[in-house]
Structures are given as C-alpha cells and as structure tokens.
C-alpha cells in the first residue's frame, strides 16, 4: 500500500497546551492491544486530566484510559481496527481536545532481541540475526528492520542497513580491522499497518579480526 | 450534517485540463481523507486517488499518475482534484468521498459530470 | 491489481424474500480478523452509500435487512427481506492494497 507521500506542509496546528501523541501495540499481551499516550509537553499539569477513547471500538462505545505516571495507558481486546477512534483529554465531562485517529496509522512494534553476530572465518563475513515476537502476531506480522552499526569510537557515525528478514550479512572487507563495533536494531510496520519505530534493541558488541600481514586477509 | 458539495458540470476538448472542487462542511477538515472516484457511462467505479488534508499528503492509483493532482485549501475545508491530457474515454461521473476508515467512504459528494469531446 | 468478481451481475428477487450477492477477490483481503472488504448501494442517478464496512460491520443509519460476511477472498452482501427501496446496484470494495479497487456491480431488481 503506498499510504501518503508528504508535500512538506505542516502537521495541523493543533498546538495548544494539552497537544499529545499515541501509539498503539496490537497483540502485545497475548490477544490484547494497547494503546498509550502522552502529552507533548512534560511540564502541564495532569493532575485532573483525563484521556478516553470513544468510536471503533467493539461492543462499548467508549473506554477511559488508566494514568501510569505521566502516561496515559489503555490494554484491552476492543479495538475494531478498522475506523477513526475520536480521542479526547477531558476534564470531568469537558473535552479540551481531541484527536480522528485511525488506530492502525500509529502502531508501534515491540522491539527485536536476542540481537547476535557471528564470524565465520571461511566465507570473511559476519552473519547478523536478530528475532522478534512479531513473527508470532496474527495482525503485523510484517516489517521492516534498520540495522545500524558503528566503529564504537565514531560517536555518530552510524550505518543503517533496511532488511525485511532477520538475517544480514556483513562483509568483512567492509568494516575496520581489529575494531571494536556497536550493533543494534529497531522495526517499523511495512504492510498495511503504519506506524512509527519501536525502541531500539539492547546493542551488541563485537569486535572485527586483526589483518593477516602475510596473506593481506584477517585473522 | 455532514455535506461534500462538487463545482458543476464540465466539457472539455481532448489534451485540454479539467480541476474539480469538493467543498466539505459538517465536521473537522483536517480529521478525515478525501479521495476521488469516478463512474464512466453505464460502468463501474474506480478509485483516482486521495488526499489527506491535515499534511497535504497525496496518494494516487498508478494508472493515473502524472495526469491527476489532488490538492486541499484549509482556509475553505476545499479540495481540488486536476485531471491533465483528457481524453474521450475520461468522460464520467466524478466524485469526491470521505474516508471513514482506511480505505471506506462514508460520505459522498453528488458527483461532477466531466464530458470530454471535440 | 486486486480483483474483484462479483455475482450473479443481476438478481430478481420477490419483495420480502432474501437477497445474497458474492465478492469474490483475486488475493485475500483479510489481516487476520481484519475483513478490508466494504460493499455500497448506488441508486440511478445518485452517489454510492455505505452499507457494510470492515465485512460485517453495518454503517450507520443502514437498515438491519443488509448484512455481511466473509473473509479471505470471499464475502457475501445479504438483504434479508428485500423492500422495493433497495432496488439498486450494489458494489464492493476492497481496501487492503493500493489501487483500491471495486467489483463490476450486481444490479437487483423485484421479480
């Protein structure tokens, strides 16, 4: 699906004090989906404020969400899926704003783990292979992955790598001898649903062979 | 209520261009999408493309791409959809319709008839 | 593209019996629980109306006669006691992949 291409104008300026963002995980506990927001500016007072979600939902009209600290959080298997959910920030029964969003547009997925890299020394490359649990989901079972890795000494420089699968090979000619690297992962969904990034996965660290002086290949 | 009101009648001659408005009122603008389809005589539907009001964001059918650009005024909650190097065979029923959902149409303009003929 | 087959492309049907429309898809249109098939209503000379979307989800304002089931690649529109007002062309649609792409139409009449 092609979804929208930008023209580079500017999100609906619905900036007043009580802007806030979503995302929803579907399947994140079993067959229950959640949905968690928050508001864009750290610093407003929730004390009274409070987020419910009406329309696109199965057998209830509305649901409220449950305060965790400065987030607004809501787990549940009544998400229709298809359809604009209205979100609001209330004060008792005053809507200060709200929000049409397509629960679908905003998933975030789970982050990949068990992140590993090995060498294998006959074929001079390192195999990547990472997992996650979205190959167990019914619903976004499809996405894309951003590898990116850096020589640990180089701050910024990181290269990314967009794969659908869980396997990469880097080639060793590629990277740094005898170098210290930082490899870590993250997903988005890329069929039907969309999204944002998950979290990055925790990194792993290993470190390239030394050249083989004599052979001009590493060790 | 929610309304989508299309601009009038058109004929065109072949190779020229036709911009169709659909003016929508009744609910938020920026909150849903406004697509285009269109019905030539006696046949069926075919979805042209659509356009998310709220960041400009355009998505067109393949078949159209290059000949067909779909624009949004907020000041006037309008949407236009223009339609280059016409041809007889663009001759339809054009309609602008709102997306309920990804990718349903809940509401529905009366349609602007575009005659293209020399 | 995604295909679309309806039928039969006409139907005659008494006043007050059933009416059943199929929707056939080239490739499934169906995440799991998520039916992306929607079917309309298009009287002569009028706009399309929504009918059912999501498969089975009956909008609003319709009346409980019309139905709908299905997934995968298959889907059904039921009108379950058909009235002289649903004299109309009906049409699905599927919205799981760009070109979203409709059926051919099934025209129902009163016998």
């Known amino acids: 699906e092609s979804g929208y291409a930008q023209n580079g104008d500017l999100e609906d300026a619905e900036l007043d004090d009580y802007s806030f963002s979503c995302y929803s995980q579907l399947e994140v506990n079993g067959s229950q989906h959640s949905l968690t927001c928050a508001f864009e500016d750290p610093d407003v007072n929730i004390t009274n404020l409070e987020f419910e979600i009406c329309g696109a939902l199965v057998e209830v009209k509305c649901l409220n969400f449950r305060k965790l600290q400065e987030i607004y959080f809501i787990e549940t298997k009544k998400f229709l899926l298809i359809g604009k959910s209205n979100i609001c920030v209330k004060v008792g029964e005053k809507s200060l704003t709200c929000k049409k969003i397509d629960l679908t547009t905003i998933v975030k997925p789970e982050a990949p783990f068990d992140l590993s890299v090995v060498y294998r020394e006959g074929a001079n490359d390192f195999v990547v292979t990472f997992n996650t649990s979205h190959l167990q989901k019914k619903y976004v079972k499809v996405l894309m992955h951003d590898v990116a890795y850096r020589q640990e000494k180089d701050e910024n420089k990181w290269t990314h790598v967009n794969l659908s699968s869980t396997k990469l090979t880097l080639l060793q000619r590629k990277l740094q001898p005898a170098a210290m690297y930082e490899i870590k992962v993250r997903s988005i969904p890329d069929h039907y649903f969309k999204g944002f990034w998950s979290e990055w996965s925790p990194s792993y660290y290993f470190r390239t062979p030394e050249i083989n002086n004599s052979s001009g290949e590493m060790d | 209520q929610v309304q989508l009101v299309q601009s009038g009648a058109e004929v065109k001659k072949p190779g020229a261009s036709v911009k169709v408005s659909c003016k929508a009122s009744?609910?938020?603008?920026?909150?849903?999408?406004l697509h285009w389809v269109r019905q030539a005589p006696g046949q069926g539907l075919e979805w042209m493309g659509g356009?998310?009001?709220?960041?400009?964001?355009?998505a067109y059918n393949q078949k159209f791409k290059g000949r067909v650009t779909m624009t949004s005024d907020r000041s006037t909650s309008t949407v236009y959809m223009e339609l280059s190097s016409l041809r007889s065979e663009d001759t339809a029923v054009y309609y602008c319709?709102?997306?309920?959902?990804?990718?349903?149409?809940?509401?529905w303009g009366q349609g602007t008839t575009v005659t293209v003929s020399s | 593209d995604i295909v679309l087959t309806q039928s039969p492309d006409s139907l005659a049907v008494s006043l007050g019996e059933r009416a059943t429309i199929n929707c056939r898809t080239s490739?499934?249109?169906?995440?799991?629980?998520?039916?992306?098939m929607h079917w309309y209503q298009q009287k002569p000379g009028q706009p399309p109306k929504l009918l059912i979307y999501?498969?089975?989800n009956l909008e609003s304002g319709v009346p409980d006669r019309f139905s709908g089931s299905g997934s995968e690649t298959d889907f059904t529109l039921t009108i379950s006691s058909l009235q002289a007002e649903d004299v109309a062309v009906y049409y699905c649609?599927?919205?799981?992949?760009?070109?979203?792409?409709f059926g051919g139409g099934t025209k129902v009449e009163i016998k």
């Open positions: 319709a709102r997306s309920g959902g990804r990718w349903y149409f809940d509401v």
């Open positions: 356009i998310d009001p709220k960041t400009g964001g355009t």
């Open positions: 649609q599927q919205s799981i992949k760009d070109p979203y792409t």
């Open positions: 999501g498969a089975s």
């Open positions: 490739e499934s249109v169906s995440i799991h629980l998520l039916h992306l």
């Open positions: 009744g609910y938020r603008f920026t909150d849903y999408e």
